[in-house]
Interface confidence: low
């Protein structure tokens, strides 16, 4: 019989219900925005905004300072007071819409939903390793701002994204705001604008450049700005918006908008559609070719990538890549395929595609019928003409006007659908050693830290743990402070180490010591931990073998048994070849001689499942007693593997030595032609791995084997005669003298 060790699912080597407690701060209200600051003199801070309040925390998440930012019109509003005696506008709560650092000063800038979306500048004052905010400056000049032209009206109550860029001695705020007709009519925030902060901190310079959704489209065409970032020579905004100005406004897609970070101009404003799909390896019938589209971006982050992922993306290590989590629709509800997918867009390729799109629009000969696009911002036109103009005049350039690139950038889910039901709500990507890790927050308040790699059919987890007991969604914005990431969920801010919260979720020594080097995991006798958790017994050097099962569970006291041991950390080499003398197996007092691997039985084991098998021949010693005993595997002097060496002993109970007894055989005669069905009765007849009934030295073909009975069909006899009949178990004869009589047919 060919018994095989049962597969152990890969998931059995880890436990994601292990509780980790990470430092946290209760903000007293739903966290609306969060940003971190690290100074060059070891001072650092976390700024956390809730409705009507701004908290300043130290690097240990302890409160350092708190500032009232609302309600507007309330005498206790500390930021409002910076604008002089009021009233400055209708009273109401202040929801923080923008919280950014101006690195040039350095200063914190906060903008809220009240007071026409104006901003406040808070200079940073280092005090030891903590930071305090100086008295706020009101970035609003009453005489410069009118309802139809308001350079100091920055934040939209519907959402605003800001990236601050230093150009020369000035700070430029790249601002993108969601608008509707009501918001647009009230102090005219713009969709996209570049505003220079005035040197005297009295507001923003008038005459700024901007693009806005045209009034006729404001009702039906809304743009959500999901993320903004600055890398290289450009600032990028990521949007979710209707795919068409004219068609169904609920048919959404994702775009990347690119603006120059070196020139405060919008002539080279470019948009590119980002297309993220789930393309399963085996396509279901009826599934769309090219994969199932996930058109709606939920969260994004750009980061340089490690060597391994860079190779897979065919780019150089350290190059910047935009990662996005996409869903099928606004509700992100379930459909066929996973709830969330992650796509990677190398920035170099984004830029190249955009540049090619400009060439297609502006280089002769231009493809006929190619539209400039962005009809929600500007008058429709065909390339190479500027918006609304019939043709180029000699002193205008095709390249100096906004453009939607005619081709989209298509990518497939890096995780191959393996996120399954998980709804990702936050994303931050870091490079650790040569590994790229996605730190993801989820709808149910968990943190998943997963290696970003596309070639596998399972997820490589650094960790997967619950942030707290509330189960509230993790919010979109994540900040980094040193070696920690700050996630917000409900009214709490949590500080999560980028190396993972610990190692206790790895349940086996092998999984523990195979963990990434940056996690600092070691084995502590019976658990996985970091050195500070068990300094006495902590080691990263070796793992004992681990026996999980063996077969058979019993064997004859006389005769041999082929024993198959199952478990892990037997070999460390897929071939299962073991050097001479490294593996000792004993069953009770008796040695079990290692057998060479039968190469015909070697099966590739997918890493999703793991099991190792070891076979040995058990020949009991004369002193071995009948009854239950232990199986023991000791491994010594093994050469080290990639992660550790195998060294130690594993013991498993449950093997029994038995003495087979033959009590009766019938019938005792049959035809010379053979084929008589013999029944042998006794005890312990099924022990071990081999048995044979011999009639005159020829095997009687076994039809059934049980503990108390064997059935076999007699072989043909040479002559009519009485011949010896014997039973061998494990190659040794069972005591007793029996004969079988061949008679004429």
């Amino acid at each position: 019989e060919d018994w095989q060790c049962p597969r152990t699912p890969y998931a059995a080597s880890r436990d994601f219900d292990v509780k980790y407690v990470v430092p946290s701060f209760s903000a007293g209200g739903l966290v609306q925005a969060m940003v971190t600051y690290e100074g060059d003199r070891n001072e650092s801070a976390v700024f956390v905004a809730i409705r009507n309040r701004l908290h300043v925390l130290g690097p240990d998440l302890k409160s350092v300072q708190s500032l009232a930012t609302g309600p507007a019109g309330d005498p206790g509003c500390q930021t409002c007071a910076a604008c002089g005696p009021g009233p400055h506008g209708p009273p109401g709560d202040t929801d923080t819409k923008v919280l950014v650092l101006d690195p040039a000063l350095p200063a914190l800038v906060s903008c809220g939903s009240s007071l026409q979306g104006r901003c406040f500048l808070h200079d940073l004052e280092p005090q030891g390793t903590a930071v305090h905010l100086a008295a706020p400056a009101c970035l609003f000049s009453a005489h410069h701002n009118r309802p139809d032209d308001c350079p100091d009206c920055v934040a939209s109550p519907l959402g605003t994204r800001v990236t601050v860029v230093e150009q020369g001695q000035a700070s430029y705020f790249y601002v993108a705001s969601s608008l509707d007709a009501a918001v647009a009519a009230s102090f005219s925030p713009r969709s996209v604008s570049i505003r220079r902060l005035k040197a005297d901190a009295s507001g923003f310079a008038p005459g700024f450049v901007a693009l806005s959704v045209l009034p006729k489209h404001l009702v039906s065409y809304s743009i959500e700005y999901v993320h903004s970032f600055h890398t290289g020579a450009f600032v990028y905004f990521l949007t979710v918006q209707p795919a068409s100005v004219t068609d169904d406004p609920s048919a959404l897609h994702t775009r990347l908008a690119r603006l120059s970070a070196t020139e405060p101009e919008l002539g080279d404003y470019r948009e590119l559609v980002l297309d993220c799909r789930f393309a399963p390896k085996r396509r279901r019938r009826g599934a769309p070719e090219g994969g199932q589209p996930y058109p709606v971006l939920r969260v994004a982050h750009s980061a340089p990538v490690g060597a391994q992922l860079a190779t897979e993306l065919s780019i150089a290590e350290g190059q910047e890549v935009l990662f996005g989590v996409f869903v099928t629709g606004k509700d992100g509800g379930p459909g066929v395929g996973p709830n969330s997918v992650v796509c990677a867009f190398p920035i170099d390729l984004l830029d190249t595609l955009i540049d090619e799109g400009v060439e297609r629009c502006c280089e002769s000969p231009v493809h006929p019928g190619l539209r400039r696009g962005l009809d929600f911002f500007q008058s429709p036109s065909f390339c190479p003409n500027p918006p609304g103009l019939e043709a180029l005049s000699p002193n205008t350039s095709c390249r100096h006007f906004p453009l939607l690139v005619s081709s989209s950038f298509s990518r497939v889910d890096l995780f191959n659908g393996l996120l399954g039901p998980v709804q990702v709500t936050a994303l931050y990507v870091t490079r650790l050693d040569n590994v790229t890790v996605a730190h993801m927050g989820t709808m149910d308040g968990r943190i998943l830290q997963v290696e970003l790699v596309r070639s596998l059919n399972y997820l490589l987890y650094v960790s997967n743990f619950s942030l707290g007991d509330s189960g509230q969604p993790v919010q979109r914005d994540v900040s980094r402070l040193g070696d920690h990431l700050l996630f917000a969920s409900g009214d709490q801010v949590f500080q999560v180490p980028i190396q993972g919260p610990g190692c206790r979720h790895f349940l086996t020594c092998g999984r523990c010591l195979r963990a990434w080097h940056f996690m600092g995991c070691g084995w502590c006798g019976n658990m996985c931990g970091q050195q500070k958790e068990c300094p006495g017994s902590w080691q990263q050097d070796h793992c004992p073998p681990k026996l999980t099962e063996f077969h058979p569970h019993s064997g004859p006291l006389r005769g041999s048994t082929r024993l198959t041991l199952c478990g892990s950390n037997f070999y460390l080499h897929p071939s299962g070849l073991v050097p001479e003398g490294t593996h000792q197996v004993t069953v009770g007092q008796s040695p079990c001689r290692p057998l060479p691997k039968d190469s015909s039985k070697l099966r590739p084991v997918p890493r999703k499942d793991f099991v190792e098998e070891f076979e040995c021949e058990l020949e009991p010693l004369g002193t071995q007693a009948v009854g239950p005993t232990n199986v023991s595997l000791t491994v010594t002097n093994m050469p080290p593997g990639k992660h550790f060496r195998v060294d130690g002993t594993s013991v498993l109970r449950g093997f029994s030595f038995m003495e087979p007894v033959l009590i009766a055989v019938q019938p005792l005669f049959g035809p010379r032609a053979g084929g008589t069905c013999l029944t042998l009765e006794g005890q312990s007849l099924s022990v071990g791995t081999s048995r044979a009934v011999l009639v005159n030295g020829t095997e009687c073909l076994l039809a059934r084997v049980s503990e108390g009975q064997l059935l076999c069909a007699t072989p043909p006899g040479a002559t009519v005669a009485s011949v010896p009949l014997s039973l061998q178990v494990g190659g040794a004869q069972v005591p007793g003298s029996w004969t079988f009589q061949y008679r004429e047919d």
Epitope: A316, D348, R360, S406
Partner: antibody, heavy 123, light 112 residues
């Protein structure tokens, strides 16, 4: 596997037009690549003639001036070369090839080539 | 147009010996994105050209690792560590940084 196959007349008279077809199997000409024509003159000199990209935009070698164009038929997964006013100087083996991905559709050179078709221009 | 100059035009080799071909461009092939679009192709007798190397040094799948490419800017080299019979044919360099794309005149690798 991607395969390209050129077809067209082997003999063309001077001043006439040369039309060649490239039939692509194993890939769609609307996928993210550029589809090129390259020719090889007697004596082995290779000349890149131009491409049509997956989106239908084209780019031509200026040396061919205005007498060269590339078009396509996406339903048949074919793209075409038309060279007007041919002379004996246009006698060559004509290859179609799949170009690169992203950067100008050419960057990584030509990974897949047809087997080539010999065209002779002669009265 | 960028002129690609290959040397030597003919290279006589012994099987098992190394071989080296040089290609020089009339202007730098470094593109603004930091990549250098220099390719090497081999045309065996009676066959169409086949790409061996792209982006200066990246080997196409199925190309033996006895082939290697190196260089930057305007000077590039193709090396074969040990020539085998199947390596005989004409080698071309191709630049695809600048339009129009241009080929070298070719180097014929033949048996001594």
């Amino acid at each position: 596997d991607v395969q390209l196959q050129e077809s067209g007349p082997g003999l063309v008279k001077p001043s006439q037009s040369l039309s060649l077809t490239c039939t692509v199997t194993g890939d769609s000409i609307t996928s993210d690549y550029a589809w090129n024509w390259i020719r090889q003159f007697p004596g082995n000199k290779l000349e890149w003639m131009g491409y049509i990209s997956y989106s239908g935009s084209t780019s031509y070698n200026p040396s061919l001036k205005s007498r060269f164009s590339i078009t396509r038929d996406t339903s048949k997964n074919q793209f075409f070369l038309q060279l007007n006013s041919v002379t004996t100087e246009d006698s060559a083996t004509y290859y179609c090839a799949r170009g690169g991905f992203y950067y100008r559709y050419a960057g990584p050179g030509f990974a897949y080539w047809g087997q080539g078709t010999l065209v002779t221009v002669s009265a | 147009d960028v002129v690609m100059t290959q040397t030597p035009l003919t290279l006589s080799v012994t099987i098992g010996q190394p071989a080296s071909i040089s290609c020089k461009s009339s202007q730098s092939l470094l593109y603004t994105n930091g990549k250098t679009y220099l390719n090497w192709l081999l045309q065996r007798p009676g066959q169409s050209p086949k790409r061996l190397i792209y982006l200066v040094s990246k080997l196409d799948s199925g190309v033996p690792d006895r082939f290697s490419g190196s260089g930057s800017g305007t000077d590039f080299t193709l090396k074969i560590s040990r020539v085998e019979a199947e390596d005989l044919g004409v080698y071309y360099c191709l630049q695809s940084t600048h339009f129009p794309l241009t080929f070298g005149a070719g180097t014929k690798l033949e048996l001594k």
